[in-house]
Structure formats: structure tokens, C-alpha cells
Amino acid sequence: SRGQYSREDNNCTHFPVGQSHMLLELRTAFSQVKTFFQTKDQLDNILLTDSLMQDFKGYLGCQALSEMIQFYLVEVMPQAEKHGPEIKEHLNSLGEKLKTLRMRLRRCHRFLPCENKSKAVEQVKSDFNKLQDQGVYKAMNEFDIFINCIEAYMMIKMKS
Amino acid sequence: SRGQYSREDNNCTHFPVGQSHMLLELRTAFSQVKTFFQTKDQLDNILLTDSLMQDFKGYLGCQALSEMIQFYLVEVMPQAEKHGPEIKEHLNSLGEKLKTLRMRLRRCHRFLPCENKSKAVEQVKSDFNKLQDQGVYKAMNEFDIFINCIEAYMMIKMKS
């Protein structure tokens, strides 16, 4: 699941090597349909503008990437596939490569932190539910620990 | 909306000053109910463990904070409020302070980036919908710009 990862995945020492290969695979898959859509695109304006690139390079990079992958997989490609079986086949291949990239980025989770759940929070919720009424007392009694967590988080963010 | 922020909010030069004040307000509000829940909590084990603090300090800090605020506001406090009007009043005050903290963190969006939407992506989706069929052709024709965005994002993430 998205929240499951090992320390090895976390470190991702292998990742930089595979990165250019994944992007190359995406570019190659796209080249199979590029001419078709280039011919069909009659408009001069740019859809993916510089402001999108800036979001990719800023605090919202993870969200931008996550949302754009979803946008292509859910909104664009299914509509684009309607242009015949050959195009559909190539787009399926392109979509699979995009999903593989997302899966690898999730696994090496510093690349897509916004898609990962905190395992510690999941554990807190699970323990809370098991404890029933006592869970409420305990969670409220430990609210100051939560404040300490907030403080630690904010101190780290202040660094930037 | 969560995706709306100005350059000023983005820089948040004012924020460090207000931070300790907000945390102090939270601690003060909590002190009003602490003894009550301390007496009620009969269990020795810790709910908010060190692993939670580690998540707050790591890649998943934003998610951990966001989920834990939600957890307290939606799951813990409503159940805790059932212990009479006085407790409810104090908890309402504590909850409001927690919501205010979240609102300020969202506004100064580098503190809660995982809760912000990319305005550029929203714009892409909006333009895509307006263009109808031409939107599909344009989005597919510009898929290589998207790959370039992914590449830039990954290069910047290579940092850590």
C-alpha cells in the first residue's frame, strides 16, 4: 500500500540510475503517438505553461506531479484512446509506463511524499479504536505530546 | 481556497513571531482539561509514541500533522465532549485554536504544502475542459512537456 515502505525504499540509493531510464521509456512510448496528436492539435496556445513548471519546482511539486499523473491517466488518455485500436494500444503502453513511474516514485517515497500516509498515524488511529472509551481519554491526556510534535514539525519547517 | 495564496503568504516573513504564541495558546487551552483526562486515563501504554514524532520530523511530517489535526478534530474531541457542558466548552476552545493554527499554516503554505493544491494544475484542467476535443489533442501533443516537468521535479528531489 502507499504507506508501506522499507528503510531501503526510503533511502533509494538505486534510484538516480534508473531515473533517466524511466524517463527515456516514457519519451520512447510517447514518440509512437506524438505525430498523430501533433497533426490533430490545431491551436497555438500552450496548455502546459511555465507556471506549471514552476509549481513542479516549488513546494507544490509533489502535488503537481501527483495531480498531473492522475489527470493524464483518468481524464486525457481514456478520451484519447477513442481514435482507433492502434492509438489505444500505444496509449495503453504509455499509461502503463506512467503508472510504473508513479509506483517507483511512491516506493522511493521521498519522491512522492504527498502520496504516502504516515504509518505512525495509522498506528495511532488503530490503537485508538481498539481502546474504545479509554482511547479518548488517552488521546486527550496526551494532547500535549501532540503539541510537542507540532512544535518539532514547525521548527524543522522554519529552517527553510 | 487551499490552492489560493499570494506571494506574501508564500514567503511568510511574519510567521516565526506568531508561531510560539499559537503553540502557547494551544498549551494554555489544553491545561484547562488536562487534569480531567489525566484522571480518566487508566492505561500505562503510550498512544502517541516516538515513531509518531519521527514521522513529524521526516518526509511525512506534513501528512502526519494534517492527519493528526483531523484525527483530533473529527474523532477524538467530539467523543471527549460528551463529558458535560464545561468540558465541551473548553474542548470547543481548544478545537478552535487547532483550526486557527491549521488555517495559518495553510495560508503560509510551505508549512502545510500537502494540503495545498497546485493552481497551475487547476488552470490546466480548467483550460482542458474548455477546449473539449481540442483539449485532448493539445494535452497529448504536450505530453513531452509533462515529461520535462517530471524530469525537473525529479532532479530537484535528487537533492536529499
Partner: antibody, heavy 119, light 106 residues
Amino acid sequence: QVQLVESGGGVVQPGRSLRLSCAASGFTFSDYHMAWVRQAPGKGLEWVASITLDATYTYYRDSVRGRFTISRDNSKNTLYLQMNSLRAEDTAVYYCARHRGFSVWLDYWGQGTLVTVSS
Amino acid sequence: DIQMTQSPSSLSASVGDRVTITCKTSQNIFENLAWYQQKPGKAPKLLIYNASPLQAGVPSRFSGSGSGTDFTLTISSLQPEDFATYYCHQYYSGYTFGPGTKLELK
């Protein structure tokens, strides 16, 4: 090792043209976005133009857009800069550089070629 | 366009000194900043990218820090080969270079 070697510089009159070349070796040229950066005598660095790895997209600074054209031939491992309608303010050492990834930093630079625009 | 300033514009120092050069940008560029070293008649050499990681092969006496609009390049103990001009470079929105800091031998 990565090597970038520029050529084609020289003295040219205002309004005339010049074509710079950059021969790349030591890396897979077609896997990298490339750029031209210039430096006027005794001055700082100024980005001129960039091109994506497959030559689909080109980007220019405002002062050269419409006059300069960046291009590449991946089969020859060569980057080009066609400079038309040259002006005195274009006088500079022109460096060919490799982008580490799209729209990010430049990790390797050539030694540069001097272009002098003078009547 | 994003404007960049570097300070000082020049400085004199001795071998073994600790030197700090700062770079300021006119708007938030997050960590999209690189540092280059250039010697007379030579090409610029990449030292640091993404504000702090060291480019492979660059001595560890060089370090970078900062985020947003304020960045720093530090040389912990100057060596004779470090006397050169240093440029910062933002790549968040387009590409801009700082005006440079000339580091001379005292």
C-alpha cells in the same frame, strides 16, 4: 569524460550572421537538454538559449528571440547557434553547456568561443 | 524577471580563511539555485546545485545553504586554487545569474 568544444566564433560586422557549433563527447548527447550562455568581456554570465533533448522545444532570452536560433543534430552530437542581425551588444564569449535535467542547472560547460561584433 | 544580487562584489582573503558569499533573489525561488566558480579565461565550473548538494568531485570545503530568497556559499578553509570569481544561478523561473563575486588573494 564529458567534453564540449565550441567553434565558429570570430569578428563580424553589425547586421551580419554567424553560426556557432558545439561538438559533444563523453556522454549520450541525445539524453540531455543543452544551452548557450554568453559572457561579455569583463562582465557576468547571461543565458542565451536552451533546447530540449529531442529538439522539440527551444527557449530564448528576449533580447535574442527572432534573431538567434538554437538547434541540434543528435546524429552528429552537435549543438548549434545561428546568430543573425548581430549587434555590438552581442559581443561575448559564447559557452555551450549541458543541462543536468530539463530547466535546471548546467553541469558541464565548454571553454567558449569569442564573438566580436564590430564595424 | 528574477533579479539577483551577490555580496560582496569582491573580497580579499588569505589561504586558510573561511569565506562566505551571499546571493539574494527578488522573489522566492525555493531551492532552485546553483553556484559556479570561474577562473580567468576558463569555463565556469559547477560547485553546488539545488542550494546545498555538492557536485561530484568538488572538495568538501565548499558548502551551500539557504532557501527562498537568501543563499550562502561558504569555503571553510581557502586553498590557493580557490581564488576565482563565483556566480550564483537561479533556474526556478527562466535562468538568471548573479553579477559575481571576485575572490582575490590578500
